[in-house]
């Protein structure tokens, strides 16, 4: 492995982004803010990328399944957090084939730097984001139930995650800003269903001093839909999403122990996301380096099951978005917003000051997060560790609880290449494929002085397509000095966040 | 490999719209890449117009963007250009290309074919 | 935009001759420059993407070079299938194309 150039791998640390945010089914599209680190080994004809990616959240939800860069600024009235990550991805090239990058693996750690940038000084407005955004379901259903009243075709859907809350207060009242994503829970399941994800931003105002936020004083709504069958891969011709072996991706906070503890501080109870699970691997993944494969005949179809309403069929691929509303938009938060009236008076801006959010439980006193030495936890175990490779794979959903026997995956470590690998209609263990390639982990919200701790690397081996020895893996550990010639520069429109990424690695 | 071949009338009348199509074999256009519309004037000149991407949003060439609209029919793996109220100045030779990321290099063109703006 | 100069519009070299045809940017394109031949009949081809790698298929013969706002790409043994027109393309924005060089067979 050695380093190379980091502006050098810029199309692949894009088209690699690109991919990763495809295979997330939940949150919000990673957008490039540098390259932090590259790392390079050519293994017969194949070349692997180890990379090391400085990333900010958008304002589009991955199910828009944009490109990063093609999110489009946010509506300036509305507040945006401000998420930043950083991924480790491993990828590959074939050939030096100029459209086939696949991303193996990744794993990446989040936080949010709202409060760490805010300036509360002399502001009559106060912002909070929250980290508990389970607390307001409540205001998702009943923004929800007027959108259906408005929109017909939504009268199936509810409310899966709720993905960012804000709260805005001033001298005009006080705003909660909730975007969440809903699922088409249909009472028949054939013929399929269009329109099974969407995405929804809900503005709920209310009088200064209201307690009852049963009760909003005005309530705006907005959603958009992603039809699945976009998401399908037509003539049975398999996605282009990377590895043949692995697919899918899964964000998840640890629940039972936090994934970061610094020096001295306590656990975070802070309530974390649930775990983000791919759908069902497409229908065929065998290899196909060597170009794209032709048509092979319809797909088979798989049952449109609610039952867990999984993600039966949203496939590997892009998603159509159909706006209900002309005036809802796909936001991305790191454009200054304009100082436009906001509904009541505010002026939610991203830089505005931001209150410390009185709900998460910021361990006082703690040391900012220091540079562990390759990503290790102060004391002495990895902060981010891999779930083992047996996973509940069941992705229970808004529509039905789960089934009492919750199947688990414990049969070997996926199909040979070629194999089929299909996932019933949401019934039992996935036969072949245990591990869930790709983790994101939502960490405490940084504060001032503290750095994003760096995601583990202790990737697991993975074997290359097309290798002469297919049981010798072919990765080698993910590097841990820094390339010489890295990080690379900061997109421009990002210099408020830089300091809160580690510029140096340890050696 | 990837292969893309375009299609559509070769002569249209001033205000009319222009329509054409993209038909791609070899590989999805749901599964991944930018799908886009190039042009070339009579003189070589070329300019992008904008793409349709394998999730659906477009993005188009401000120039154009109030006249074109890309759209696509995954069920026969085609994408299409529509420009509207087309002048003598949108002559030109028209091609489809896929790009691995948006826009940044396109890897695969098809053969282009000619449209002629013309009472 | 971006606009992308090719200051020779046309040249014509003997086969087997090393041949450079230069793009210029007017801002710096972060070596987001491609290079497509189009043969007379109309048909295009990416030869060389970022800068100066080359697309799967192409002779070892083309190369390309350059970073900020100065590009080239160099054919270093002319071929007689080598004759057609060179384009540079930028797509570090929105893509914009230089005017072509024309390259003919003494």
């Known amino acids: 492995v050695s380093p190379t150039d980091c502006s050098a791998v810029e199309p692949e640390a894009e088209k690699a982004l690109d991919l990763i945010n495809k295979r997330r089914r939940d949150g919000y599209l990673f957008q490039l803010l540098r390259i932090a680190d590259a790392h390079l080994d050519r293994v017969e004809n194949t070349t692997v990328y180890y990379l090391v990616l400085d990333v900010q959240e958008s304002d589009c939800s991955v199910l828009s399944r944009k490109y990063w860069n093609d999110c489009e600024p946010p509506d300036s009235r509305r507040p945006s957090e401000i998420v930043i990550g950083q991924c480790k991805v491993i990828a590959t090239r074939h050939s030096h084939e100029s459209q086939d990058l696949r991303v193996i693996d990744f794993n990446c750690t989040t936080s949010s730097v709202s409060s760490a940038l805010a300036n509360t000084k002399d502001s009559p407005v106060l912002i909070d984001f929250f980290e508990d955004t389970e607390r307001y379901r409540k205001q998702a259903n009943k923004a929800l139930e007027k959108y259906k009243e408005e929109n017909d075709d939504f009268a199936s859907f509810r409310v899966d995650r709720i993905e960012r809350v804000a709260r805005v207060r001033g001298g005009e009242g006080t705003g909660y800003f909730v975007d969440f994503s809903v699922r088409n829970c249909p009472r028949h399941h054939f013929p399929r269903h269009p329109n099974v994800f969407g995405f929804c931003r809900a503005d709920l105002f209310y009088d200064v001093e209201a307690l009852d936020l049963e009760s909003p004083k005005n309530l705006v709504i907005n959603c958009e839909v992603f039809d699945p069958q976009e998401h399908e891969n037509i003539n049975g011709v398999p996605p282009h999403l990377g590895h043949p072996f692995h697919w899918g991706g899964h964000e998840r906070s640890s629940t039972t122990k936090p994934p970061f503890k610094p020096h001295g501080s306590r656990d975070h109870h802070h309530p974390h996301k649930p775990h983000e699970h791919g759908p069902p691997p497409p229908p065929d993944e065998r290899d196909h380096s060597h170009g794209p494969p032709l048509p092979q005949g319809p797909p088979p179809l798989l049952p449109m099951s609610c039952s867990s309403c999984q993600h039966a069929t949203f496939g590997t691929n892009g998603a159509q978005r159909h706006s209900h509303n002309n005036n809802s938009s796909d936001l991305h938060p790191h454009k200054h917003h304009s100082h436009e009236q906001h509904p009541h008076g505010h002026h939610p801006h991203a830089h505005h000051p931001h209150e410390h959010d009185t709900h998460r439980q910021h361990p006082h006193g703690h040391h900012p997060h220091g540079h562990h030495p390759h990503g290790h936890h102060p004391h002495g175990h990895h902060p981010h560790g891999h779930h083992p490779h047996c996973h509940d794979f069941q992705d229970y959903g808004p529509c039905d609880p789960p089934p009492h026997n919750q199947g688990h995956c414990c049969h070997g470590h996926g199909p040979p290449p070629g194999h089929l690998r299909r996932r019933g209609p949401g019934k039992g263990p996935r036969p072949f494929h245990c591990r869930q390639i790709g983790s994101v982990y939502r960490l405490p919200p940084l504060r001032k002085g503290e750095v994003l701790p760096l995601p583990e690397a202790n990737f697991p081996s993975f074997p290359l397509p097309h290798h002469k020895h297919p049981l010798k893996p072919d990765n080698q550990p993910f590097p841990q000095s820094v390339s010489e010639s890295c990080p690379g520069k900061f997109k421009s429109g990002f210099p408020q966040v830089s300091m809160f990424f580690t510029h140096t690695f340890p050696k | 490999e990837v292969q893309l071949q375009e299609s559509g009338p070769g002569l249209v009348k001033p205000s009319q719209s222009l329509s054409l199509t993209c038909t791609v074999t070899?590989?999805?256009?749901?599964?991944?890449?930018?799908w886009n519309w190039i042009r070339q004037f009579p003189g070589n000149k070329l300019e992008w117009m904008g793409y349709?991407?394998?999730?659906?949003?477009?993005n188009y060439n401000p120039s154009l963007k109030s006249r074109i609209s890309i759209t696509r029919d995954t069920s026969k793996n085609q994408f299409f250009l529509q420009l509207n109220s087309v002048t003598t100045e949108d002559t030109a030779t028209y091609y489809c290309?896929?790009?691995?990321?948006?826009?940044?290099?396109?890897?695969?063109w098809g053969q282009g074919t000619l449209v002629t703006v013309s009472t | 935009d971006i606009q992308m100069t090719q200051t020779t519009s046309s040249l014509s070299a003997s086969l087997g001759d090393r041949v450079t045809i230069s793009c210029r940017a007017s801002?710096?394109?972060?070596?987001?420059l491609n290079w497509y031949q189009q043969k007379p009949d109309g048909t295009v081809k990416l030869l060389i993407y970022?800068?100066?790698r080359l697309h799967s298929g192409v002779p070892s013969r083309f190369s390309g070079s350059g970073s900020g706002t100065d590009y080239s790409l160099t054919i270093s043994n002319l071929e007689q299938e080598d004759i057609g027109t060179y384009f540079c393309?930028?797509?570090?924005?929105?893509?914009?194309f230089g005017g072509g060089t024309k390259l003919e067979i003494k």
């Open positions: 290309a896929s790009a691995s990321y948006r826009y940044a290099w396109f890897a695969y």
């Open positions: 070899g590989y999805s256009i749901t599964s991944d890449y930018a």
């Open positions: 349709i991407s394998y999730s659906g949003s477009t």
């Open positions: 801002q710096d394109i972060s070596n987001y």
């Open positions: 970022y800068t100066s």
């Open positions: 393309q930028q797509g570090n924005t929105l893509p914009t």
